[in-house]
C-alpha cells in the first residue's frame, strides 16, 4: 500500500441541523476493502460508535433514533481495512434545534423596504444568550453569527442591511444559543418575510449587484453592511 488510506466521506440525512426528538442517520463511506467503521465525537470518549459495513462494504450507517443534547457536536469517521485505519473524514457538525425557547424576529423600521434604503433585522430572546444566528431560506451559506465579545449575555442582536437590494428579499428566521455549546440552538423564530420593492431611481435592481463572484445571489452568504451596534456582539461569517 503506497501512502495512507484515503479518508472516508461523512454526511447526515436528512441533514445536519435536527430538531430535538427527530431521527437522523449519519453515513460514513469508505472503500470496498473496509472491514469496520468507527465514528468519533469531539470531546467524548472514543470510540463514539462502531458499525460493521453494509454491503457492498463501502459504507456504514450510524442511527440516532431521537435527537438529544448528547448527540449534538462535531464528528469524524474512520474505516479499518486489512492494512490498517484510514485517515479521518472531514468533520460533520450535528446541530440540534429546540434546546431553548424561540426568539422573536422583527424588521426595523418595517419588513417592507425600498431598494437602496436600510433595514435592520432584530432577533430578541426572552432569556439572555450570547450567540444569535440569522438564517435565510434557500441560501447555500445561510448562517450569519453575532456573538458576544466577552461572554456577555444579550437579549437581542441587530442585523443591519444597507443598502438593501432584491438579493436581500426572502424569508428569514433566527436562532439563539449559549456559548458553552454552539451545537445547541433555540427553536427557530417565526418566519419573517422581507419584501424589497423597487425605487424610482432603480425600479428593478440587479440581483447580482452586491455579489462579487459569478454565482447567483442565493449561493452567497448574507452580507449586510454597516457596523455592529453597541451591543458587545461581534459578527462572524460561517
Amino acid at each position: 500500500q503506497a501512502g495512507p488510506l484515503p479518508k472516508p466521506t461523512l454526511w447526515a440525512e436528512p441533514g445536519s441541523v435536527i430538531s430535538w426528538g427527530n431521527s437522523v442517520t449519519i453515513w460514513c463511506q469508505g472503500t470496498l476493502e473496509a472491514r469496520e467503521y468507527r465514528l468519533d465525537k469531539e470531546e467524548s470518549p472514543a470510540p463514539w460508535d462502531r458499525q460493521n459495513p453494509l454491503e457492498p462494504k463501502n459504507k456504514a450507517r450510524f442511527s440516532i433514533p431521537s435527537m438529544t443534547e448528547d448527540y449534538a457536536g462535531r464528528y469524524r469517521c474512520y474505516y479499518r481495512s486489512p492494512v490498517g485505519w484510514s485517515q479521518p473524514s472531514d468533520p460533520l457538525e450535528l446541530v440540534m434545534t429546540g434546546a431553548y425557547s424561540k426568539p422573536t424576529l422583527s424588521a426595523l423600521p418595517s419588513p417592507l423596504v425600498t431598494s437602496g434604503k436600510s433595514v435592520t433585522l432584530l432577533c430578541q430572546s426572552r432569556s439572555p444568550m450570547d450567540t444569535f444566528l440569522l438564517i435565510k431560506e434557500r441560501a447555500a451559506h445561510p448562517l450569519l453569527h453575532l456573538r458576544s465579545e466577552h461572554g456577555a449575555q444579550q437579549h437581542q442582536a441587530e442585523f443591519p442591511m444597507s443598502p438593501v437590494t432584491s438579493v436581500h428579499g426572502g424569508t428569514y428566521r433566527c436562532f439563539s444559543s449559549h456559548g458553552f455549546s454552539h451545537y445547541l440552538l433555540s427553536h427557530p423564530s417565526d418566519p419573517l418575510e422581507l419584501i424589497v420593492s423597487g425605487s424610482l431611481e432603480d425600479p428593478r435592481p440587479s440581483p447580482t449587484r452586491s455579489v462579487s463572484t459569478a454565482a447567483g445571489p442565493e449561493d452567497q452568504p448574507l452580507m449586510p453592511t454597516g457596523s455592529v451596534p453597541h451591543s458587545g456582539l461581534r459578527r462572524h461569517w460561517e
Epitope: K41, E43, S44, P45, A46, P47, W48, D49, R50, D70
Partner: nanobody
Framework: EVQLVESGGGLVQPGGSLRLSCAAS????????MGWYRQAPGKQRELVAA???????KIGDSVKGRFTISRDNAKNSVYLQMNSLRAEDTAVYYC???????????????WGQGTQVTVSS
C-alpha cells in the same frame, strides 16, 4: 468466558477512599470505551465514569470532584478512584465496555459481574 473482572470493593467509612479495578481481555480493552456503572437498591443503574481509548474521560455529575477514572493500557485495566465517600455511594459497581454511545443508552456491549461498595460507619 469472563471478559471483565472487577475487584476492590468493600466496606468503608464515610469520608474514606476505595480504588476499584477492572481487568479486561486485550481485544475488548484496546478498542472500547471502559467505564463504571453503579446500582443502589431500588434505584436505576447510573453511569459513574467512562474513559476512551485516547484517555478522554467523562465523570457523572453526582461524583464529580470526588471520583476519577484511569486506564492502564499495559495491563488492560481500568481503575475507579473513589474519594470522600458518602453513604449515598453505597451500591454495586459494574465495570462495562463498549462504544460510548452505548454507555449513554445504558447498553454497553460487555459487563462485569459487579463488586459491592458499602459506605457506613
Amino acid at each position: 468466558e469472563v471478559q471483565l473482572v472487577e475487584s476492590g470493593g468493600g466496606l468503608v467509612q464515610p469520608g474514606g477512599s476505595l480504588r476499584l479495578s477492572c481487568a479486561a481481555s486485550e481485544s475488548i480493552f484496546s478498542s472500547n470505551v471502559m467505564g463504571w456503572y453503579r446500582q443502589a437498591p431500588g434505584k436505576q443503574r447510573e453511569l459513574v465514569a467512562a474513559v476512551g481509548i485516547q484517555g478522554l474521560t467523562k465523570i457523572g455529575d453526582s461524583v464529580k470532584g470526588r471520583f476519577t477514572i484511569s486506564r492502564d493500557n499495559a495491563k488492560n485495566s481500568v481503575y475507579l478512584q473513589m474519594n470522600s465517600l458518602r453513604a449515598e455511594d453505597t451500591a454495586v459497581y459494574y465495570c462495562a465496555a463498549g462504544a460510548y454511545v452505548r454507555f449513554l443508552q445504558q447498553s454497553p456491549d460487555y459487563w462485569g459481574q459487579g463488586t459491592q461498595v458499602t459506605v457506613s460507619s
